[in-house]
């Protein structure tokens, strides 16, 4: 058989070979499509109702003025010419709209770097058969369950014009460190070959990096650094760089004799540990960051802890955590 | 570590302009957008706009186009908010903050005749 | 511009109990919101991101949660510290906006 395809609301006419150019003629059509049960037969005498989906015209051919959707199926034609040699022709027919050009909605103007984030919601309207919508980032497609990417996707059918409108809603993960304006748009491919794609407007949303890039965060737990003796003090350090760098304690400026961790526990405070504490990240790429002070100090029955925050040190009962 | 220094009081006349500025050190100036924040006495928080020192684009809320005005000299890692045609509207504090999460001590405005 | 709603101006609560301060979108912002605190004559400060990530330094105690338009910032056990005024803020469109803010007094 051979394809044809049709645009939805467009003429078509499908040529009956073999068949003589004019009356008489000895010829008949067999339809099989969304409009007939099984084999519909139409003959160039025609009449009656399916004259206004489909006749055969003076030359054989078949003429449907307007395609739509129950048109697609199988259309073939047996004529005979004046010596009595029989010729078929045989058509697949497949039709096709092609939607409004596709819109981001809903679209965010921030994204947050390290975290998932809905960048917006590509809608196309109208197409048939569906296609497909894909999202690109600066002009490079992006491929779903890859590097922080998802996307939900949504297929509704119009109950009276049988057109299609898809969704796809794009969440991604910016990561920390990155372009602080990329570029997203969305494209919709038509479902049938040879048309070429639609591409929505771009959007440029500014990313938020909330933990700074380059700042080493200590955390110190309890707050404050204050503590009674015997008690204990943990030190976190947060890098938000990846790979992750190694981590190395200094106390009162002097680096300590334990091996690389990010955690540092001081169990059984005692006034050895007093003094002011930092870690020092070194990246592979760029060097070593320290960062900022906090002391660790003793509070004796009955003292008020020093603020939250403030600067200060350790000591040497401690235990570093991989 | 990183720090915002905001300048001093500023008393203007209505009508008048004014420019404030925010000196960044601690952290590279170019790599953080730059945002601007005002808080009229006893009221909430309104977004004014943001600069990304590193090539200069900004971008404002609506409300504040043709009165704020932001611009960063990378040279001295300093962002600067000017603001034109002022009335007694404007008075208040305005803070700049590094990507929300270091904060200048705000500069408090006051406008009267 | 989306507007934040924070329902409650004020607070009352005791040292040790556990409050929650809710915000609410007038459409959807996904998980885009973050909450602030500002102490009286300071600046504002960033405890929670992107509806439940807290900041780097935060105390554990400060949690977030929420998607859509209901957001909730939860103090698990408040302290003497923990005195002041909690802003909601949406960062999914420009421009940013604020809830009015929730002033936690201490009984």
């Known amino acids: 058989a051979q394809n044809i395809t049709a645009r939805i609301g467009e003429p078509l006419v499908l040529k009956c070979k073999g068949a003589p150019k004019k009356p008489p003629q000895r010829l008949e059509w067999k339809l099989n499509t969304g409009r007939t049960e099984a084999w519909k037969v139409l003959s160039p005498q025609g009449g009656g109702p399916w004259d206004s989906v489909a006749r055969v015209l003076p030359n054989g051919s078949l003429f449907l003025p307007a395609v739509g959707i129950q048109d697609e199926g199988i259309f073939r034609c047996q004529a005979m010419n004046r010596n009595g040699k029989e010729t078929k022709s045989n058509y697949r027919v497949r039709v096709y709209q092609i939607p409004g050009k596709p819109e981001i909605v809903d679209s965010a103007s921030e994204l947050t770097a390290g975290v998932p984030n809905k960048v917006g919601t590509c809608v196309s309207e109208g197409s048939y058969p569906a296609g497909t919508l894909s999202w690109h980032l600066d002009g490079k497609p992006l491929v779903p369950n890859e590097k922080g990417v998802s996307v939900k996707e949504q297929t509704r059918r119009h109950p009276e014009t049988g057109l299609f409108t898809l969704q796809s809603e794009l969440m991604v993960t910016p990561a920390r460190g990155g372009d602080p304006r990329p570029t997203f748009s969305c494209s919709f491919s038509p479902g049938l070959p040879r048309h070429r794609a639609l591409r929505t407007a771009p959007i440029q949303p500014r990313v938020w990096e909330p933990v700074p890039l380059e700042e080493v965060q200590l955390v110190v737990e309890p707050e404050g650094g204050a503590v009674a003796p015997g008690g204990t003090v943990t030190l976190t350090c947060e890098v938000p760089a990846q790979p992750s760098p190694q981590i190395h304690w200094m106390k009162d400026g002097v680096p300590l004799p334990l091996p690389p961790s990010p955690v540092l526990i001081l169990p059984e405070i005692g006034p050895q540990d007093q003094g002011t504490y930092s870690c020092v990240a070194t990246h592979s790429s760029h060097g070593p960051q320290e960062s900022r002070a906090v002391s660790i100090s003793i509070i004796e029955p009955g003292e008020e802890g020093p603020t939250a925050g403030s600067v200060g040190g350790s000591g040497l009962g401690t235990l570093a955590l991989a | 570590e990183v720090q915002l220094q905001q300048s001093g009081t500023v008393l203007a006349r209505p009508g008048a302009s004014v420019k404030m500025s925010c000196k960044a050190s601690g952290y590279t100036f170019t790599s953080y957008w730059m945002h601007w924040v005002k808080q009229r006495p006893g009221q909430g928080l309104e977004w004014i706009g943001a600069i990304y020192p590193g090539d200069s684009d900004t971008y404002y809320n609506q409300k504040f186009k043709g009165k704020a005005k932001l611009t960063a000299v990378t040279s001295t890692s300093t962002a600067y908010m000017e603001l034109s045609s002022l009335t007694n509207e404007d008075s208040a504090v305005y803070y700049c903050t590094r990507n929300w999460d270091y904060w200048g001590q705000g500069t408090t405005l006051t406008v009267s005749s | 511009d989306i507007v934040m709603t924070q329902s409650h101006k004020f607070m009352s609560t005791s040292v040790g109990d556990r409050v929650s301060i809710t915000c609410k979108a007038s459409?959807?912002?996904?998980?885009?919101v973050a909450w602030y605190q500002q102490k009286p004559g300071q600046s504002p400060k960033l405890l929670i991101y992107?509806?439940?990530y807290r900041y780097t330094g935060v105390p554990d105690r400060f949690t977030g949660s929420g998607s859509g338009t209901d957001f909730t910032f939860t103090i698990s056990s408040v302290q003497a510290e923990d005195l002041a005024v909690y802003y909601c803020?949406?960062?999914?469109?420009?421009?940013?906006?604020f809830g009015g803010g929730t002033k936690l007094e201490i009984k």
């Open positions: 459409q959807d912002v996904s998980t885009a």
């Open positions: 992107s509806a439940s």
């Open positions: 803020q949406q960062h999914y469109n420009t421009p940013r906006t």
